[in-house]
Interface confidence: medium
């Protein structure tokens, strides 16, 4: 058959199977006079053969892993042995067959991770080979963890990268895992070929020793420092540590004081640098900080808490230079004339701060003394021995000593005497009508004037109005504000109108004076007055807790996990149902009920972090009103990139034969992030058999130099394999192949005589 | 391709200002934390400032605290580092860098541009 299994002698390509018998001749060239039989020279391997008449076949099983590509030269020659035609390229190129099992490059693998990482932050690779091609299925590699050891309540603390073999924590993990309960963990990890797919992937397993350290970057317990401390400053209240040695500390006051008295050392100890005092201030709170030795924060800040204990440091004060109260003629004896308030400084609900009242003197003594008595520790003055008389003695002064357990002060009050109250506050209408109000109309809006009058002696508590609302408002939503001239009281929005808890409320006041009626008045219908508040329903929207939800996670979390979480609530109480908008990389799902939201593709850090969405809250139900929010999710980097080479080097040869050792230079690359230095690759050849051969030196950082121990090459391609190791933490490690050809030169350049592919550079060394 | 381009260093004297500019381009501006971080001369490198995308959040090292201040305008994909009170010590080459968190390592920074603080 012309064109497929015979044909002229021209440049030709032929794919073949490795591992497959011989079944059939790959081509059969036709001589052209005067051209007779044919040659066959290159990389036969004693494999490749052709018949003078132009079969050409092979003669046993391919391996690709020993040779992927055979460059051999078929000549035609005549009858006196003189090629005529040719030499042409014939490329036999090996195709891969599934007949290398990965290998992990170490049968046990010890790490070890901090509690409290974060989830998806590698801290150990695993690393296995496979000979088979990596550009096929045969030779992509696919890790699982098989089985956790100890497992608890049958929770997986750790995950694995199936394509780079990156562990790490998982979410449970970074919460749970505790050094205290359980120090180390046992992993035994598979990898299979075939990308994991297939039943007839090979596979390998390794074991991995897990040990958890403690994280000591933990806010320490808050701490309790009394006041007014006499011992020498500074003194040492508490302590914070960073996991590793090295770190440079500061405390940040978020408050702003004016003076700010506590610093902290380069070992992590904290002190308070001169002495506290409570009635200034009696807790702070400030944050402790580690950085690196650039002065970047290594991670967040740690709250410390102080809290100042009290002394008894501060004497009683009085409520008002002269405190004033008034009491009616003829008031019975035991009736409550005021309660007389002093303060103290020290803390409240403490022997510091608890007071007694005594009194130490009364002017005039007339008729008698000890017209007055006042509750020892209530402060309540009271009428002690008969009714007062305005016209005998109109003001009385009392001297009353206030103490607590230390300290004593006087403070100074005086009595009026006034006319009896034998009037009541009268409504000047008993019924305010019907007032409708939107349920959003603001706080401290006055909704109505109401008005009531007293006959008694103005200007004394007898006349004074105070308005209660007594009915109709328990929630306390209103209030009464009265106009001390005029007695008018001004109802108020204390609180917000809710029309779905009270739509309408029957409301009723109370005008009462604050001095008591007289014996045989009481208050009746015409110190009450009513009124009726109609709420109408605005429809609100659901509201988020948050404007901006952000969240954090590694890159190469797997899918499914759980990213963060949005809350919103309805004002009316419906259901809220969730959903996203602008999730252009289609990358997340949202719970419509409980607003978490989980990964359903795999993120990519170098698409763009933060990766930002709308998350909408929409009532269920009602008018379907929304709210929008936004939710950003920042994507951290992981080592997740082996070294490579920085650029394609195919084309690179040697003149063959070398006249002197030589070499060529080439440069690494990797796609993960690099602190202030850059990366630190070192070099190394791939395989042990190549030292006769080769050696790779560094240059620096990112180069390196490949050179030739001796001139003895054969003229043929070598494959050079260099193994890059980016000293990460923890290390990841490429295995790159450098082709080098070794070849006759014309002018300096390599000879490709017909089929030579253009385009691909040469480089000569 | 990612490119950072300081701009505006030169000479001051001690107690006057400046105002150093970094152009942005290859990445989106406002998806990253920017920083400013200083090397002076024969010492190692020093963090400076870092600011948040949208500007909420910034940071200061103690020692340009209260005298310099991080902005950025991410119309323009511009951050800025106004220095005022210099100092001799603040005698450096500036580089701005970016990274995705405040915590992670700079990803990307520019070939910077020298401020002298001189009489």
């Known amino acids: 058959q012309e064109g497929k299994f015979s044909g002229p002698l021209k440049p030709m390509t032929f794919s073949i199977y490795e591992g497959q018998e011989p079944s059939q001749i790959i081509f059969q060239f036709k001589a052209n006079p005067p051209a007779v039989t044919f040659e066959l020279t290159g990389e036969t391997d004693n494999i490749f053969v052709i018949e003078r008449e132009g079969l050409l076949y092979y003669n046993r099983a391919l391996d690709r892993e020993t040779r992927s590509t055979h460059n051999l030269q078929v000549a035609a020659l005549d009858a006196n042995g003189i090629i005529v035609e040719g030499p042409v390229p014939i490329t036999i190129k090996v195709k891969d067959i599934n007949d290398n099992r990965p290998t992990f490059l170490q049968s046990k693998y010890e790490g070890s991770v901090r509690q409290n990482s974060r989830p998806g932050k590698p801290f150990l690779y695993v690393n296995a080979t496979d000979l088979d091609d990596p550009a096929t299925p045969n030779g992509q590699l696919y890790y699982q963890i098989v089985i956790q050891l100890p497992m608890i309540n049958n929770v997986m603390y750790f995950q694995i990268n199936n394509k780079t073999g990156a562990i790490s924590l998982t979410r449970e993990g970074s919460q749970e895992l505790n050094p205290a309960k359980n120090p180390s963990y046992n992993l035994v990890i598979s990898v299979k070929d075939m990308g994991g797919q297939s039943e007839n992937s090979f596979s390998d397993t390794t074991s991995v020793d897990i040990i958890v350290t403690e994280n000591i970057w933990k806010a320490p317990k808050p701490v309790e420092m009394v006041e007014n401390s006499t011992d020498p400053h500074p003194i040492k209240i508490t302590q914070v540590r960073w996991n590793d040695p090295g770190a440079q500390y500061s405390l940040v006051d978020k408050e702003k004081l004016p003076r700010f008295p506590f610093s902290i050392d380069q070992e992590g100890d904290i002190y308070v640098t001169q002495p506290l005092d409570r009635e200034e201030k009696d807790a702070y709170v400030f944050y402790a900080v580690a950085k690196d030795e650039y002065g970047k924060p290594l991670s967040y800040p740690l709250e410390i808490h102080v809290k100042v204990k009290d002394i008894n440091d501060n004497p009683p004060t009085c409520p008002s230079p002269v405190t004033v109260f008034e009491v009616q003629e003829n008031e019975r004896l035991g009736n409550s004339i005021g309660t007389l308030t002093a303060h103290d400084r020290d803390e409240e609900n403490t022997a510091n701060s608890f007071l007694n009242y005594r009194i130490v003197e009364q002017t005039p003594k007339l008729p008698m003394d000890g017209l007055f008595l006042i509750q020892t520790y209530a402060g309540m003055l009271q009428l002690a021995k008969q009714s007062l008389k305005k016209q005998d003695t109109p003001q009385y002064n009392l001297t009353i000593e206030v103490s607590d357990k230390d300290f004593k002060t006087l403070c100074f009050v005086q009595i009026n005497v006034i006319d009896i109250n034998d009037q009541i506050p009268i409504f000047e209408k008993s019924d305010y009508g019907n007032l409708t109000l939107a349920e959003d109309t603001n706080i401290g809006s006055t909704i109505l004037t109401i008005q009531a009058t007293d006959a008694d002696e103005p200007f004394t508590g007898s006349s004074k109005i105070l308005y209660h609302i007594i009915k109709g408002d328990s929630e306390g939503r209103l209030g009464v504000d009265t106009d001390p001239h005029t007695n008018t009281g001004y109802v108020i929005i204390k609180k917000p109108l809710d029309f779905e808890t009270a739509a309408v409320s029957n409301i009723v006041f109370k005008a009462e004076n604050p001095e008591p009626l007289v014996f045989g008045v009481k208050y009746n219908a015409s110190s009450f007055a009513k009124f009726t508040l109609i709420v109408t329903d605005v429809n609100e929207a659901p509201q988020f807790s948050q404007h901006v939800f952000q969240a954090k996670v590694s890159e190469d979390v797997a899918i499914g996990t759980k990213v963060g979480n949005v809350t919103a609530k309805d004002p009316e109480g419906l259901d809220i149902s969730y959903s996203l908008r602008g999730d252009t990389r289609g990358w997340l799902k949202i719970d419509h009920v409980t607003g978490e939201i989980f990964s359903v593709a795999p993120l990519d850090r170098e698409a763009g972090s933060p990766y930002r969405v709308q998350v909408v809250a929409t009532e269920v139900g009602g008018s379907s009103l929304s709210s929008v929010s936004e939710f950003h999710l920042i994507l951290m980097d992981v080592n997740d990139n082996p070294p490579r080479l920085a650029k394609d080097y195919t084309g690179l040869f040697f003149c063959h034969p070398l006249s002197a050792p030589g070499s060529l230079i080439f440069e690494a690359t990797d796609d993960d992030q690099h602190l202030f230095r850059g990366p630190h690759f070192t070099f190394s050849l791939g395989s042990g058999s190549l030292q006769n051969d080769w050696e790779v030196s560094k240059i620096n950082g990112t180069h390196a130099r490949l050179s030739t121990r001796h001139t003895e090459f054969e003229e043929r391609e070598y494959v050079v394999l260099i193994r890059i190791n980016d000293g990460g933490r923890p290390p990841l490690e490429g295995i790159v192949s450098l082709p080098v050809t070794f070849c006759s030169c014309v002018e300096g350049s390599c000879f490709r005589p017909a089929g030579h592919q253009t385009g691909i550079p040469t480089v000569g060394m | 391709e990612v490119q950072l381009l300081e701009s505006g260093g030169g000479l001051v004297q001690p107690g006057g200002s400046l105002r150093l500019s970094c152009a942005a381009s290859g990445f989106t501006f406002s998806d990253y934390w920017m920083h400013w971080v200083r090397q002076a001369p024969g010492k190692g490198l020093e963090w400076v400032s870092a600011i948040w995308s949208s500007g909420g959040s910034t940071y200061y090292a103690d020692s340009v605290k209260g005298r310099f201040t991080i902005s950025r305008d991410n119309s323009k994909n511009t951050l800025y580092l106004q220095m005022n009170s210099l100092r001799a010590e603040d005698t450096a080459v500036y580089y701005c860098?970016?990274?995705?968190?405040?915590?992670?390592?700079?990803?990307?920074w520019g070939q910077g541009t020298l401020v002298t603080v001189s009489s």
């Open positions: 860098a970016k990274s995705p968190t405040l915590y992670d390592d700079f990803d990307y």
